[in-house]
Interface confidence: low
Amino acid sequence: WSSKVLMSSANEDIKADLILTSTAPEHLSAPTLPLPEVQCFVFNIEYMNCTWNSSSEPQATNLTLHYRYKVSDNNTFQECSHYLFSKEITSGCQIQKEDIQLYQTFVVQLQDPQKPQRRAVQKLNLQNLVIPRAPENLTLSNLSESQLELRWKSRHIKERCLQYLVQYRSNRDRSWTELIVNHEPRFSLPSVDELKRYTFRVRSRYNPICGSSQQWSKWSQPVHWGSHTVEENPSLFALEA
């Protein structure tokens, strides 16, 4: 599939509807405490973690998480089967690959089992919440005497779904040069100085063809090319995290 024009909808709005359900009118004497917001991220389309700040609860409460997809044959919520804990209190849920459907609205409900009327429902667009693995297998090759090509690989995600940020600098540079590479896991540097030592690194995000995720992956392991003869003050040129 190819995209002629990128979509102009409000896709960045990942926290679509936040519906806080309060007590029925006849029980309004004590206001219902808001529940913490649930944040979900899909890690490399291998699993998803939905987490919340359990320490925001005034007293230790094992909140429960239920989820479903907006359009599905079975419209009932299912409870999390793999809770994450913080100090022995539920603070998240891990959902496995088989239950991830990127292109349906994911409806997630957080509930206080002690007070069933205290619940919050959020709708999330999972294709905007994908965080890929860091690119791997960075390799450098000479296309010509002064031209370098950098290639890399991404695991489990189609390359056409990813956008890459390449950073490089020489041992003479105080800052990185960076550029965006769309969909092709390669980059060529037309002119390199063989007396310099270059460092390259890459990260990726699930954007813009298959999703609109703003979250970058971690940086790849850096790779180096060039002369080791030119020494500079290493403290000036240490890699940033």
């Epitope: 599939w1 979509m7 909808s9 292109y103 349906q104 609205t105 063809i209």
Partner: nanobody
Framework: QVQLQESGGGSVQPGGSLRLSCAAS????????MGWFRQAPGKEREGVAA????????YYADSVKGRFTISQDNAKNTLYLQMNSLKPEDTAMYYC???????????????????????????WGHGTQVTVSS
Amino acid sequence: QVQLQESGGGSVQPGGSLRLSCAASGSTYANYLMGWFRQAPGKEREGVAAIYSGGGSTYYADSVKGRFTISQDNAKNTLYLQMNSLKPEDTAMYYCAAASAVKGDKGDIVVVVTGTQRMEYDYWGHGTQVTVSS
């Protein structure tokens, strides 16, 4: 609810053209993702083309790029698929599909970007048959 009704199918010789129409009724149409899918006998239903009516973005399967054109007439609530240079492998039942937007606090959010997956769509028509043979 949205109802979709396709028309315009038929038999045509290789190299010929057809224009499919899909009339949408029953709900607001302005912020839908609309798509055309096809299913040949014994094969999976596959995406052919899609258009996001809110922004005019269009998407095509590689196999039809340059030959098929998706368009819409919002005033008539109708989606079209202009099919040129038809080939025998285009023979299939053609379905119109629509995916509704989710209401978000910053406006409508369409829960789809590529238009490729069957599960992205909420509503389906009953199909119209296209046969390409000499």
